[in-house]
Every structure is written in C-alpha cells, then in structure tokens.
Interface confidence: low
C-alpha cells in the first residue's frame, strides 16, 4: 500500500499510550475535508510495544529506542510515505509515570527525555511526550467514547454501534481501568458541583457539557493488587500468605522489596521478619471481595456523597461505557454481555475463583500464567470498585456497557487526546463549509 495513490485526501495521526504495564501505539485516519465532523476519525492500527511500561526503563533508558522501534516502523509501513512529514505523533504517559514522578521528578524527566529523542528520529511530525494528568485521562476517555458513539452531533455517522443507535444524544459516562489508576467521568444530573477539583466544562459542537471526573491513583488493577498484598501480609503469621484472590493450588513467591517499590503500598509498609513470602491461593470470592473492600476507606466523606477515600461522587447518571481493563478482564471472564445481571456476574466469579489452578491452566492453555493467575483478583476488584466504590447497584449495573472497541476504534483516552491536540473538536457546530474556529477543549 506504500505507494498507492490515495483516492481522497486522507490525514493520519499517531498517539502512543505509555501506560503503567505496557505502551500501545494507535494510528488514526480521517478524510481531510471532514476533519471537523464528529465521528469521521477512526483507528486503523494498534501496535502493542513488546515489554513493560516506560516507567520500568528508569534504570535502562538506553534500551528505550529499541523498545519503540517495532511499532514506530509499523507506523512507517501503514502510513503512506507522502504523509509521513505531516502526521503528528503524540506520546501521553499515564499513572505509571505519575507514580515514578512522585518518587523522583528527575528520573521521570530522564525517561521522557530519552523517549522524546527516540521519537524525534522518525520522519513524522513529533509533537512531544508528556505525562497527562488523571483529569485529562478521564476527560479524553469520555470524549473518545462519546465521539465514537456519535453523541456530539445529530449528523449521519460513518460507523455503527447498533445498540446505542437511538436519537438519544445523552452522553455516556466513561469508566476507565488501567494498571495504576482508574477514572470515572460523566455528566451528572445536577450541574452544580460540591467539588470544583472534579468539575470540567466543555463546549463541543455548540453544546455545553458540565462533566464530573476523578482519577484514583493507585487504584488501577495492578497497583490495587500490590496494595491488597501489602495490607494482607501485615497480618500474615509467617511468610505464607493464604490468599482468597488466587485459585486453589496456586503458588507464587514475592519479594518484599518488590512489594514496597511502589508509592501505592507506602501506607501499609512495615518491617517484616522475612525478605520473601509465598502466596498460596485458596480461591474464595467472598473472602477476596472482603479483602478488596478494605482498600476503600468509606468511613470519611466531607461531601453529600463520596466514592471512597473522601472523594466527592455525585449520583450516577445515565449509561456508562467501561473500557480498557474493565473490558479486557470482563471479556476474558465472558461477562461482557448486556444480558448478564450483576447477580449472575457475582455467581460466575464465585465459580471461577474456586476452580483449581491446575484446571484453570489447562482450560486456558494459551494465556500467560502471570495474567491468568490474576483474573480472579481483577474480576473481584472490578465488581468491588463498581458496586462499593462507585455505588452502582444491581439495577444500575444494566447501564454499564463493557466496551473494547467501538466499530474498530479502541475505547480509551488516546483518540480524544489527539482530537483535542489537532483542534478537531470545534466548540461550535460546524456548518457544511469548514469555519475558522477558535475555542477548543
């Protein structure tokens, strides 16, 4: 396809999502003459970078260039050569790098510096690498799914996401779960907010949106697991941790130094009489659920209503798209169907967690054991977070739609981020001829 003549003027954009557990490169394309329409940008490629998140390269920054090579070369192949120089490249780093910056601003800057230098070597229009805020991550995720669902405009859409294809322009809330943080973003019924920190105002396509958002750092699924282990090991009588969140028969040795490496476990840190401990799975959903609930402090709330840890949360409103790890985990567990009630999900989780580890390994032979071993915890954590953390109920569970892609484009913050940085979301509804516009998100 490299030298094929393009039938229409197509533009491309690249966003790298430098997450806590891995980096993904997304390539988007859109017809140039329609760039202010809603729903015209779509994803043509996702390239998952081999290896961990960029924050793990803090002691080996010289390897970052090689780390990014495959996916950047893939972008070179996918995007026609004639378009390379005008294709913007953005890298946004999320909670993994936020945590590294909390430990050492200097180390975080060093990683970003090397990333920038590596990306500048490619023939694209590199626009910079930065650590985005939790608020931005929530907001851009919300923009992405509503843009792809066609919620910002009455115009004909180029894609189809049939269940939501009503004339209803009510936006979806966004639920994003990463490895190190989780975000909740939605338009509440009541426009006045008790917490200005959690309030965002947008004007998009001629309509005003008052959005609530919060990002819970350390409450992504990986960091939540580290927190739970750090909490539970405090009360272990010896270096054996019988853990209900892992399958019966599962065993794994954990270094205490690894456990306390992350800022997320600082509140549970104590001097232990051993350098290593062994997790022994007992596979009990109910006990796992109880253990997870202890991560959420619900005893203190300075507002009319809180999520947890004293963070304001207005009453939930409307439908929600749950994506990233919410989707990956629930999809693996086969629990994404709209027909599966919350009670049924709980039942399935009980059954799944109690399955012996050897049986699980046989049933899912193609899945890496590291990931496979954590689905019981992750599924339980998702249920706990949604029900006890965000106060969804058995009834409002039906308003949660687990979304991986919306007709080929991944749900996540990257598309919203690119739309904003390329000025493709106008404040006012564009006329049929493009207007010069000034106000963006």
């Amino acid at each position: 396809t490299q030298n094929k003549a393009l039938p229409e003027n197509i533009k491309y954009g690249i966003v790298l999502d430098a997450g806590s557990s891995h980096t993904s490169l997304y390539i988007y394309k859109w017809p140039a003459e329609k760039e202010n329409d809603t729903g015209v940008v779509h994803q043509v490629e996702e390239c998952r970078v081999k290896g961990p998140g960029i924050s793990k390269y803090v002691q080996k920054v010289n390897e970052i260039g090689i780390y990014l090579t495959d996916c950047m070369e893939r972008a070179r192949e996918v995007i026609p050569r004639s378009q390379h120089q005008e294709t913007p490249v953005y890298l946004g780093a999320t909670a993994g790098m936020r945590l590294l910056r909390m430990e050492s601003e200097e180390l975080a800057d060093r990683v970003l510096d090397v990333v920038e230098r590596s990306l500048s070597n490619y023939p694209f229009d590199f626009q910079g690498a930065r650590i985005i805020t939790g608020q931005e991550e929530g907001a851009y995720g919300w923009i992405t799914i509503n843009y792809l669902l066609g919620k910002f405009s009455q115009k004909t859409r180029w894609f189809s996401i049939v269940p939501y294809e009503t004339n209803n322009q009510e936006t979806f809330g966004a639920l994003d779960l990463g490895g190190a943080s989780t975000q909740i973003t939605f338009v509440p019924q009541n426009q006045t907010t008790e917490s200005p920190d959690n309030a965002l105002q947008f004007r998009l396509y001629g309509k005003d949106y008052n959005v609530y958002t919060h990002s819970f750092l350390c409450y992504g699924k990986d960091q939540a697991l580290w927190q739970k282990l750090a909490k539970d090991i405090q009360v272990a009588s010896n270096e054996i941790l019988r853990d209900p969140c892992f399958h019966p028969g599962y065993k794994k040795v954990v270094n205490v130094s690894d456990l306390y490496k992350t800022p997320c476990t600082k509140r549970f840190e104590m001097t232990l009489p051993f350098q290593q401990f062994e997790i022994q799975g007992i596979g009990n959903y109910q006990q796992c659920h109880q253990s997870v609930l202890e991560l959420f402090n619900t005893s203190y709330c300075p507002y009319s209503q809180c999520a947890f840890n004293g963070i304001f949360l207005p009453p939930l409103q409307g439908d929600f798209g749950a994506f990233s790890a919410f989707y990956f985990v629930m999809n693996f567990l086969n629990l994404t169907s709209e027909k599966v009630s919350q009670e049924k999900v709980t039942e399935m989780m009980k059954k799944f967690c109690s399955q012996p580890w050897e049986e699980i390994k046989t049933s899912y032979a193609g899945v890496k054991e590291k990931y496979l071993s954590e689905y019981c915890f992750s599924g339980t954590y998702i249920l706990s977070l949604l029900l006890q953390g965000y106060h969804f109920t058995a009834d409002s569970w039906e308003h949660i739609h687990f979304i991986g892609k919306i007709q080929g484009s991944d749900a996540g913050w990257t598309l919203g981020y690119m739309l904003n940085l390329t000025n493709m979301i106008p404040a006012e509804q564009p006329l049929s001829t493009p207007l010069s516009h000034s106000t963006y998100v």
Epitope: E46, S160, P163, E165, T336
Partner: antibody, heavy 119, light 107 residues
C-alpha cells in the same frame, strides 16, 4: 417467532436490475440493523451490505459499491436490496440477517432467494 | 480489511468423534466473532457469538474458544445432524468478513 423471508430472485441478463425484498416478522424490526449476505454456487458466504435501524448508517462490500443499494421500510417491516448493472459473478443465493449488538449479531437468517445472472 | 483464515476447509469424521475448527484473524478482533452452521438445504443458524457464548437452544456439545488471534469451534461428540458447513464471521469492523468455511462430512 422470528422470521425473515427473502423473495424476488430470478433470472436476469447481465447489465440488468432487480430489487430483492426481505420481509421481517416476530420482532421489532425498527430496533435492528440488517445485513444482506450472499453465497455463489459452491462458494462460501460473502457479506454484501448493512443498514442500521434508522437507515442513518450504511455499508457496502467493495464488490457491490456503486451498483447495489440497501434500504428499508420500517413501517412495512421490510428490507430491500436494489441491484443494478448486474454481472455473472453476482449469481448467488442472497440471504438477509438481523443484527443488534451485543448478543443479536446476525442471530437470525432468512432461507435465501436465488439470483441468476446469465444471457 | 480483516482476513479470516479458516481451517480445515473440509473434514471427514465419525459419529461420536470430537472435532475442532479454527479461524485466525489477521488483525485484533477482540472476541467479536460468531460461528454459523449451514445445513445442506441452505439454512443458516448461528451457534456462537462473542467467540465463546453459546446461543440458546444450541446443544452443549458445541463450544467456542479463543486463544490470542485464533478462534475455535469444538464439537465434543458428533451427531448426525452436525454434518454441515461451518463459517466464522468477524464483527469487529466493516467490511464484515467470513472465514472460507469448513465442510464437515460423515466418514
């Protein structure tokens, strides 16, 4: 009981036109997206076109783009496929199927109607 | 476009036998895959959606599985009515694409 019934097939000369209807019953037709899928003799299934519940979204396979038009009449619970500039390679059994994300994706199919393009 | 490579293209098996058919997606389809059965009279029936969810009324001997970009349909113990053509279809993006089909014949 969900039913999809295609009709209107027959013998057409190359370059000719034909409109295939698909009558739907037993479900709320206006809630569902609809597809046309075809199968040439002794060949596999080939997706042809899709129309969303409110006709706002339409897709075609490259092989039929510009020649075929998918449409629907929700009041009459009927899906249509207007075919023009027909070629011998359009000879196939044509099926309609309904679609509602998440769990009703192509879950019910019609029995098919045969189109033969030959001189 | 996403290519769906289905194998084998034909298969002869005996009653009571366990058989597996596979579809490989050329790009990520995130489990957006259905399996269809086409009887000799042309009747098409969906067996499985979302890669592994069994349609209601479909016998439990049918199961769907996913391993990375490989998707499989397994019939645990063949019965006479199972001899038919089988197709996978991806619904992750347009155009929708089918696998080439597998003709399951009685040995």
């Amino acid at each position: 009981e969900v039913q999809l019934v295609e009709s209107g097939g027959g013998l057409v000369k190359p370059g000719g036109s034909l409109k295939l209807p698909c009558a739907a019953s037993g479900f709320t037709f206006s809630d569902y997206g609809m597809h046309w899928v075809r199968q040439a003799p002794e060949k596999g299934l080939e997706w042809v076109a899709y129309i969303s519940s409110g006709s706002s979204i339409i897709y075609y396979a490259d092989t039929v783009k510009g020649r075929f038009t998918i449409s629907r009449d929700n009041a009459k619970n009927t899906l249509f496929l207007q075919m023009t500039s027909l070629r011998s390679e359009d000879t196939a059994m044509y099926y309609c199927a309904r679609d509602l994300y998440y769990d009703h994706v192509l879950d019910y199919w019609g029995q098919g109607t045969t189109l033969t393009v030959a001189s | 476009d996403i290519q769906m490579t289905q194998s084998p293209s034909s298969l002869s098996a005996s009653l009571g036998e366990r058989v597996s058919l596979t579809c490989r997606a050329s790009q990520e389809i995130s489990g957006y895959l259905i399996w269809l059965q086409q009887k000799p009279d042309g009747t098409i029936k969906r067996l499985i959606y979302a890669a592994s969810t069994l349609d209601s009324g479909v016998p439990k001997r049918f199961s769907g599985n996913r391993s990375g970009s490989d998707y499989s349909l397994t019939i645990s113990s063949l019965e006479s009515e199972d001899f038919a053509d089988y197709y996978c279809l991806q619904y992750a993006s347009y155009p929708r694409t089918f696998g080439g089909g597998t003709k399951l014949e009685i040995k």
